[in-house]
C-alpha cells in the first residue's frame, strides 16, 4: 500500500530574469527513493538517480541547476516557463509519487499589483 | 472592460460530448491564465483547471483529467473547455474565469454556461 | 488535495451586523518564498461570483472597505464590519498555493 505523501514548496510566483527554486519531499513512507524526475508538461528536464546521480536534458542545461537536495533550481525564467511541473519520486517497494508545483513568471512590469517576487 | 462571454446553455444525452466557449475582450489574451470552475448543486465549486494561452499550457484538477478538455484559439481570443462522456453527475453551472496575475486568483468570470444532462 | 473548511455554513445577519466568516485549510497555504494565496469571493444571486480579497488581506479593485482580510498559514478569516443589503450571497474562499486549486464550502449570507 502507497502511504506517502509529497509536500512541495507550492505554487510560485516569479519575475522574468531571476530565479526559483522547486522542490518536493517525501514522507510518511519507508520507501527507498530510487530516481526522482523533473517534468514539465511531456518534457523531461532533469534526473536525480540514487546510483548515478544528476542527468540535466540537455535543452535545459543552460538554465536548470540540480539541488538544492533532490530539488531543481530554474534561472534566467522566461514567460515561457510558466507552467506546471512535476516532481516523480520513483520508490520501492512503493511505485511512483507525483507532485505538482505551479510556476507563472511575470514580466516586471507585473508588479502592477504589488505581487512579492523573490529571487533565492 | 474586461470581458469573458460565454456561450449558451446545452440540453445534452448522456455519453455525449459538449463544447463551451468564453470570448474574451477588453484585455490582452494571452497575458492571462484562463480557469475553468464547476458549480453544482448551486453551491460547490470546483476548480477543473487552467489554460496558459501564452505557450498552450494547461493544468488540470486530476478529478477532471479525463473529463474536461481545455483549449484555446488565439485568433479570436477564445477559451474552450469540452466536456466528455457526460452523466448526470456532469450537470451544472460552467464558468470561465480569468487569472489574476501574481496572486494564484481569478478576477473576472464569465456569465457561466448551465449543462444539462439528460435523456 | 487540500481540503478548505468554511464556518459557518449559513450565517443569519441584521443590516448593520459585523460578522467573520472563517476558512481552514488542511496544510500550510504559505509557500516556501513566505506567499500565501488565498483568496475571498462574493456570489450574489443571478450573478457570477466576484473577487473581493486576494492574498489573504488586499482588497480587489472597488471593494469597500467594510471587507477585511487576515490570517495566516492554516486560518484565515473575512470580516464584514456593516453588512448592506448587497452583501448577501454565498461567500467563498479560495486556496491557490497548492495543486489543485480548492474552494472552501461556501458561507451563506442571509437575513433572520
Known amino acids: 500500500m502507497m502511504t506517502g505523501t509529497i509536500e512541495t514548496t507550492g505554487n510560485i510566483s516569479a519575475e522574468k530574469g531571476g530565479s526559483i527554486i522547486l522542490q518536493c519531499h517525501l514522507s510518511s513512507t519507508t520507501a527507498q527513493v530510487t530516481q526522482v524526475n523533473w517534468e514539465q508538461q511531456d518534457q523531461l528536464l532533469a534526473i536525480c538517480n540514487a546510483d548515478l546521480g544528476w542527468h540535466i536534458s540537455p535543452s535545459f542545461k543552460d538554465r536548470v541547476a540540480p539541488g538544492p537536495g533532490l530539488g531543481l533550481t530554474l534561472q534566467s525564467l522566461t514567460v515561457n516557463d510558466t507552467g506546471e511541473y512535476f516532481c516523480i519520486y520513483h520508490t520501492y517497494p512503493d511505485g511512483t509519487y507525483t507532485g505538482r508545483i505551479f510556476l507563472e513568471v511575470l514580466e516586471s512590469s507585473v508588479a502592477e499589483h504589488g505581487a512579492r517576487f523573490q529571487i533565492p | 472592460e474586461v470581458q469573458l462571454q460565454q456561450s449558451g446553455p446545452e440540453l445534452v444525452k448522456p455519453g455525449a460530448s459538449v463544447k463551451i466557449s468564453c470570448k474574451a475582450s477588453g484585455y490582452s489574451f494571452t497575458g492571462y491564465t484562463m480557469n475553468w470552475v464547476k458549480q453544482s448543486h448551486g453551491k460547490n465549486l470546483e476548480w477543473i483547471g487552467l489554460i496558459i494561452p501564452y505557450n498552450g499550457g494547461t493544468s488540470y484538477n486530476q478529478k477532471f483529467k479525463d473529463k474536461a478538455t481545455l483549449t484555446i484559439d488565439k485568433s479570436s481570443s477564445t477559451a474552450y473547455m469540452e466536456l466528455l462522456s457526460l452523466t448526470s453527475e456532469d450537470s451544472a453551472v460552467y464558468y470561465c474565469?480569468?487569472?489574476?496575475?501574481?496572486?494564484?486568483?481569478?478576477?473576472?468570470w464569465g456569465q457561466g454556461t448551465s449543462v444539462t444532462v439528460s435523456s | 488535495d487540500v481540503v478548505v473548511t468554511q464556518t459557518p455554513l449559513s450565517l443569519p445577519v441584521s443590516f448593520g451586523d459585523q460578522v467573520s466568516i472563517s476558512c481552514r485549510s488542511s496544510q500550510s497555504l504559505t509557500n516556501s518564498y513566505g506567499d500565501t494565496y488565498l483568496s475571498w469571493y462574493l456570489h450574489k444571486p443571478g450573478q457570477s461570483p466576484q473577487l473581493l480579497i486576494y492574498?489573504?488581506?488586499n482588497r480587489f479593485s472597488g471593494v469597500p472597505d467594510r471587507f477585511s482580510g487576515s490570517g495566516s498559514g492554516t486560518n484565515f478569516t473575512l470580516k464584514i464590519s456593516t453588512i448592506k443589503p448587497e452583501d448577501l450571497g454565498v461567500y467563498y474562499c479560495?486556496?491557490?498555493?497548492?495543486?489543485?486549486?480548492?474552494f472552501g464550502g461556501g458561507t451563506k449570507l442571509e437575513i433572520k
Open positions: 479560495l486556496q491557490g498555493t497548492h495543486q489543485p486549486w480548492t
Open positions: 474565469a480569468r487569472g489574476f496575475r501574481g496572486y494564484f486568483a481569478v478576477d473576472y
Open positions: 492574498g489573504i488581506s
